[in-house]
């Protein structure tokens, strides 16, 4: 049976809804999106519905939507090309975001190389369930063009979020850029806090506090590096950092016998699955300045 193309497929990028004309006595419906990388995304669709909603998709590379509908009489298959209309090279580029200090996020981008002088960009963010849209509340500008965004309230975000940079110009059509970003990948941790060192005659015990994070993480999700070094060391005598897994009580005990020279300990943190290291904590010092033999640990 020859497939007929009369479904009148249409797509609303704001809601990520693909709709088509309902067919009588539908027995089976499927919808797909295929991108240039060969990735296929297929949402759930029930036979009673004549639409499907996409969630985790990016559109800026140009995509093809496809709908298959079987009825008791015939088969329908229809494709809809969804190109990124506008002049090539006008979209925002080098887009990136990072979450810092738990509650803040900065996103930055560069103007497209073919973008006209009057181009203006606008950032919209939706959580991955597409249930809430945030418009950038505070833009960072370069010669009047928006090239970044600062957010001081991340309450609407989820573990994965959709970022859309639209562009406008009086001269030509501007292409859009969109991206799905995991908060796991973009959060920069603060360094560990409350770093303390206590020593007895043979050992020193370092303790620290797990940094507060935007994501809900357990102690198992943290990896730490400790840099224990002698103060006033010769340049070029670098210590290898000590790797310590997160624990309910973050501590590291190491041999260091008295008398001990003055040392400093600093610590940094990362997500175990990502290893994007935080900056180093303030150094905690131990030992004394008096000149005596140094026990190497």
């Amino acid at each position: 049976e020859k497939p007929a193309s009369s479904l009148n497929v249409r797509f609303d990028a704001r809601t990520m809804n693909l709709t088509w004309d309902c067919q009588e006595n539908t027995t089976f419906s499927r919808c797909f999106l295929t991108d240039k990388k060969g990735r296929v995304v297929e949402p759930r669709v029930t036979n009673k519905e004549c639409s499907c909603t996409f969630r985790e998709i990016c559109l800026h590379g140009g995509v093809t939507f496809e709908v298959h509908v079987n009825t008791s009489q015939r088969t329908f298959q229809e494709k809809l090309l969804y190109p990124n209309s506008g002049r090539e090279g006008t979209a925002a580029q080098n887009f990136s975001c990072f979450i810092y200090n738990v509650d803040f996020m900065n996103c930055t981008w560069a103007r497209g190389p073919k973008a006209p002088r009057d181009v203006q960009y606008f950032l919209y963010i939706q959580n991955s369930k597409r249930r809430r849209e945030i418009q950038c509340p505070y833009y960072i500008e370069d010669s009047g063009t928006h090239v970044g965004c600062h957010l001081g309230n991340l309450s609407g975000l989820t573990s994965r979020n959709y970022f859309l940079v639209n562009g406008t110009s009086q001269e030509i059509g501007i292409q859009f850029f969109d991206s799905l970003l995991d908060t796991k990948k973009i959060e920069r941790f603060n360094p560990p806090g409350n770093v303390t060192v206590r020593c007895n005659t043979t050992h020193c015990l370092v303790r620290w506090k797990q940094p507060r994070t935007y994501q809900k993480l357990s102690y198992l999700d943290f990896q730490y590096q400790l840099d224990v070094h002698r103060k006033n060391m010769q340049p070029g005598t670098e210590n290898l950092p000590i790797n310590v897994s997160g624990d309910l009580e973050n501590r590291y005990n190491f041999p260091s016998s008295e008398p001990r020279a003055k040392h400093a300990v600093k610590i940094r943190a990362a997500d175990v699955r990502i290893l994007n290291w935080s900056s180093w904590s303030e150094a905690a010092e131990f030992g004394s300045d008096e000149r005596h033999h140094h026990h190497h640990h």
Epitope: K37, R39, V40, V41, E42, P43, R44, F54, R55, E56, S128, K129, R160, D182, K184, Q223, N243, A270, D271, V272, R273, I274, L275, N276
Partner: antibody, heavy 123, light 107 residues
Framework: QMQLVQSGAEVKKPGASVKVSCKVS????????IHWVRQAPGKGLEWMGG????????NYAQKSQGRVTMTGDTSTDTAYLELSSLRSEDTALYYC????????????????WGQGTLVTVSS | EIVMTQSPATLSLSPGERATLSCRAS??????LAWYQQKPGQAPRLLIY???SRATGIPDRFSGSGSGTDFTLTISRLEPEDFAVYYC?????????FGQGTKLEIK
């Protein structure tokens, strides 16, 4: 502790279909993304796709389009992989897998695996 | 897609020896790399994620290192139960891809 338990081995003829199940315990299905990885005899591991049981979205490679369907039954916490129009090259061990941090397109490491289901396609 | 290439294909060593397995990505995957162990008739088991962090319950004789395109799994002192096939897998780019495996066998 989370466990994934898969259905038993299947022998199918070319052109037929097969449906492999993956029962989750220790978590509810809607909290997870379930991925399917296959391993042909004596070969390496190949990611097939991922499925979000909460909203039903599936993510897979174009070469599987039209032959692969991933579904889930949230009432029984069971995920399913259905393969249609089977060919001899579909003979493989099929694993369901998930992790502590997953979406439909990847996991930050597959922490948990089913024991595997051997599907043999032979005339 | 990112191609992961493991070497050597087979490594023959004796218990007590040190094993070094390599994995190279066709483009940078940052630290988004996992290592798995698979024994005959069993499912793969996650050993390492984030290129160097050991998964829960993995003995400390297993260690991972590297970032970008070159990664190493080291087993400091081989135990009889360590002889298996080892796979690396990147999760930086879609689709997630595995290496072809390194078989670690008893000499």
């Amino acid at each position: 502790q989370m466990q994934l338990v898969q259905s038993g081995a299947e022998v199918k003829k070319p052109g037929a279909s097969v449906k492999v199940s993956c029962k989750v315990s220790g978590h509810t299905l809607t909290e997870l993304s379930i991925h399917w990885v296959r391993q042909a005899p004596g070969k390496g591991l190949e990611w097939m796709g991922g499925f979000d049981p909460e909203d039903g979205e599936t993510n897979y490679a174009q070469k599987s389009q039209g032959r692969v369907t991933m579904t889930g039954d949230t009432s029984t916490d069971t995920a399913y992989l259905e393969l249609s129009s089977l060919r001899s090259e579909d003979t493989a061990l099929y694993y369901c897998a998930t992790g502590r941090y997953c979406s439909t397109d990847t996991c930050y490491g597959f922490d948990y695996w089913g024991q595997g289901t051997l599907v043999t396609v032979s005339s | 897609e990112i191609v992961m290439t493991q070497s050597p294909a087979t490594l023959s060593l004796s218990p007590g020896e040190r094993a070094t397995l390599s994995c190279r990505a066709s483009q940078s995957v940052s630290s988004y790399l996992a290592w798995y162990q698979q024994k005959p008739g069993q499912a793969p088991r996650l050993l390492i994620y984030g290129a160097s962090s050991r998964a829960t319950g993995i003995p400390d004789r297993f260690s991972g290192s590297g970032s970008g395109t070159d990664f190493t799994l080291t087993i400091s002192r081989l135990e009889p139960e360590d002889f298996a096939v080892y796979y690396c897998q990147q999760y930086n780019n879609w689709p997630p891809t595995f290496g072809q495996g390194t078989k670690l066998e008893i000499k």
